[in-house]
Interface confidence: medium
Amino acid sequence: ATSCPQNVNISGGTFTLSHGWAPGSLLIYSCPQGLYPSPASRLCKSSGQWQTPRATRSLTKAVCKPVRCPAPVSFENGIYTPRLGSYPVGGNVSFECEDGFILRGSPVRQCRPNGMWDGETAVCDNGAGHCPNPGISLGAVRTGSRFGHGDKVRYRCSSNLVLTGSAERECQGNGVWSGTEPICRQPYSYDFPEDVAPALGTSFSHMLGATNPTQRTKESLGRKIQIQRSGHLNLYLLLDSSQSVSENDFLIFKESASLMVDRIFSFEINVSVAIITFASEPKVLMSVLNVNSRDITEVISSLENAKYKDHENGTGTNTYAALNSVYLMMNNQMQLLGMKTMAWQEIRHAIILLTDGKSNMGGSPKTAVDQIREILNINQKRNDYLDIYAIGVGKLDVDWRELNELGSKKDGERHAFILQDTKALHQVFEHMLDVSKLTDTICGVGNMSANASDQERTPWHVTIKPKSQETCRGALISDQWVLTAAHCFRDGNDHSLWRVNVGDPKSQWGKEFLIEKAVISPGFDVFAKKNQGILEFYGDDIALLKLAQKVKMSTHARPICLPCTMEANLALRRPQGSTCRDHENELLNKQSVPAHFVALNGSKLNINLKMGVEWTSCAEVVSQEKTMFPNLTDVREVVTDQFLCSGTQEDESPCKGESGGAVFLERRFRFFQVGLVSWGLYNPCLGSADKNSRKRAPRSKVPPPRDFHINLFRMQPWLRQHLGDVLNFLPL
């Protein structure tokens, strides 16, 4: 059989072959970061010759060339330095404005290894127009310099650069430009996952969020759409399984889609998910018309059942047909619900297209997009009802122009991306949905992305302190109530002197609240068993604080979910008739349950809660603690069944000042408080002035470290008595 020659090495890089040296095999070059391959690929033709795509000649020796970033073509009302034809990776460009103009955006930008500039477009603006000066991104040329209501500006890119974003923008009545900022990029450039996740996530959480659309802050540029709890979202996942997608990459497409589905169902909104795989023809694996499209297990199951081999007979990339099948699905649903009904008109639609290349058959996918926009009646007023995300994976044959044409264009948002590989895609989907943008009191939502602050990761976490030093920690369980430990209040009851420090996005120090009332468990008495030789006893170590004002929900302040409540039931996605026992069985379902608490410095530390037989062996070392319990005969006199036990294996131990803080678990991307830090046999912060320092117990310590946490499942009567009007409790 014919095979292609093997003299295809690339100097300074590597290559992979899709099907060895046989005809039909695709050779893909790759280079170290900061370099790009030229040519990017070759195809082994049936004649046994390598064909190099497009402009490059087949005989060209493959080389790794340095990535460069585009230079500014023009910069209005200011100057930039240095003035180069293009800029090397790591190179900077600086901007300054003429007198009377204020610089908006980044004064200094650096060329990154992916051929993209960091920061934001620099604009010198005097604030004269109805809309702000839209600026000119690096490498672009703008025509139109009037910024009044109805004025239009047009953009094109200098030679060899590709425009993404809107080529034309209009100044709207609300003082905002239509569409999205145009960016000129090198054809070989791609996006880093850490840029895509927040951009995609911001846009997506706007669709799921519930905030005031007029509030535009730096960290969440763009509109935020109201999806009421009664609202509905149709999510259409389109997965490319054409020949150029390897089977392994298709698996990662599926995995990424699963992550997306899992995350989307963790919002308390009504969602239907369609799954369509496509090559030459689309295959609908789940339709939004199917009642199962609302059931996460069914959706995940149909994703898992998606087979790479489903498309082995037709291996082209027919993006038009895939989008057209979405259109047909919409059309069927519209007929079913009635075009004029609210039920149809209030559905929001999001399409996520995962592809590795450009469509090469079936006509222009743009036609299908136009049909979709038409059927959904997408106009300026209804722009929020459709979002199309076009994500290209693998720099090889992805067509920037096509992706850009398909992706939605909304101010301050991006909907078209190219990622280097499927690994990067997986990273994006892992971190994209930042549910913490929600402002209602949805519980147990923490920002899990890598760049989130400690307080954003655990926004329920509060510090309780008297006027002097910090003493205890606690957890928000609603917008006005904090759950903590009773022993924090054993030295004096004048709560007017106390403050509760709650996370606040505007201040790294948080915001202080006064306490309206403290409800301390009447059963708590540290000296209750002194006459039995038990110097300290922490039974009923639980307290509630009502804050003087309600806390404004934000990325930094949000309640944790308390088990045995309707709120937690929704977050666990359990059926309506669930009981408190069901929650306990789901959350504390193993002999050793991984859990967390928050350290003095705000970081999340790991412990393992011991259950059943392991609880007994975890607790029994207390008998070796001769200082606190000099003549203890029965461990259960000290460690009652009110306590959870941790401190074995590689567990961290809480420090004295961490008492009252939540002991919590993560399930389905939501957080649930099962206990609160009460007491322990070892203080890892003893003698350490540094908040970041904790010394593990020496391996020879007797007794070994053990930590005991009030088990909230054992405190239900008391919690219900005091929080019955605040939370909706399930039957026991």
């Epitope: 961290e652 890892p684 320092s693 904790r694 593990r696 020496p698 391996r699 020879s700 007797v702």
Partner: antibody, heavy 118, light 111 residues
Framework: EVQLVQSGAEVKKPGASVKVSCKAS????????MDWVRQATGQGLEWIGD????????GYNQKFKGRATMTVNKSISTAYMELSSLRSEDTAVYYC???????????WGQGTLVTVSS | DNVLTQSPDSLAVSLGERATISCRAS??????????MHWYQQKPGQPPKLLIY???NLKSGVPDRFSGSGSGTDFTLTISSLQAEDAATYYC?????????FGQGTKLEIK
């Protein structure tokens, strides 16, 4: 004052076993782990393993697992290390060392020279 | 196992001069906010003696010309002004997890 006193020098034939003792005084024996470290002439230090006298739990360097056995007699505050199937390369000074609160070896015995020779 | 590599293997320093010994670990020895790296001095015919614990803490009774620094995988023992009695072999040792390991030792001589 903390003191660790080890047993005297031993000469053994290849294939035999040796048991070195380490008597502790000046602190509560069960409060700290006891470690065993050896040093061949002109060579560096090599950790053999440790024992928690309270629980009699042990941790071994894989290299010695199966050949080294560490035990304690709490009533006389003494730790023991037995090494079996001796070979000539086991000729070394064997030290017991007491761990402190930082898992460092704060106190050392004077050492026991074990010579393996046919 | 965590391999500790000391450098140099030996060095000669004049009295009153500064001596610096490095120890590099193949894996981080940091946990719970502390670096579980310790330094010992050993003179011929004697057992080792603990000088520095947890990377930078001077054991009581040890002269303050000895100091330790470093974090994660790279550590340094410094003798600020060398005295005659400091001629010895110095070892680093980690106790981050089992098995504990020692560096190969650095022999310090007076020039």
């Amino acid at each position: 004052e903390v003191q660790l006193v080890q047993s005297g020098a031993e000469v053994k034939k290849p294939g035999a076993s040796v048991k070195v003792s380490c008597k502790a005084s000046g602190y509560t024996f069960t409060d700290y782990n006891m470690d065993w470290v050896r040093q061949a002439t002109g060579q560096g230090l090599e950790w053999i393993g440790d024992i928690n006298p309270n629980y009699e739990s042990t941790g071994y360097n894989q290299k010695f697992k199966g050949r080294a056995t560490m035990t304690v007699n709490k009533s006389i505050s003494t730790a023991y290390m037995e090494l079996s199937s001796l070979r000539s390369e086991d000729t070394a000074v064997y030290y017991c060392a007491r761990e402190d609160d930082h898992d460092a070896f704060a106190y050392w015995g004077q050492g026991t020279l074990v010579t393996v020779s046919s | 196992d965590n391999v500790l590599t000391q450098s140099p293997d030996s060095l000669a320093v004049s009295l009153g001069e500064r001596a610096t010994i490095s120890c590099r670990a193949s894996k981080s020895v940091r946990t719970s906010g502390y670096n579980y790296m310790h330094w010992y001095q050993q003179k011929p015919g004697q057992p080792p003696k603990l000088l520095i614990y947890l990377a930078s803490n001077l054991k009581s009774g040890v002269p303050d010309r000895f100091s330790g620094s470093g974090s994660g995988t790279d550590f340094t023992l410094t003798i600020s002004s060398l005295q005659a009695e400091d001629a010895a072999t110095y070892y680093c040792q980690h106790s981050r997890e089992l098995p504990y390991t020692f560096g190969q030792g650095t022999k310090l001589e007076i020039k």
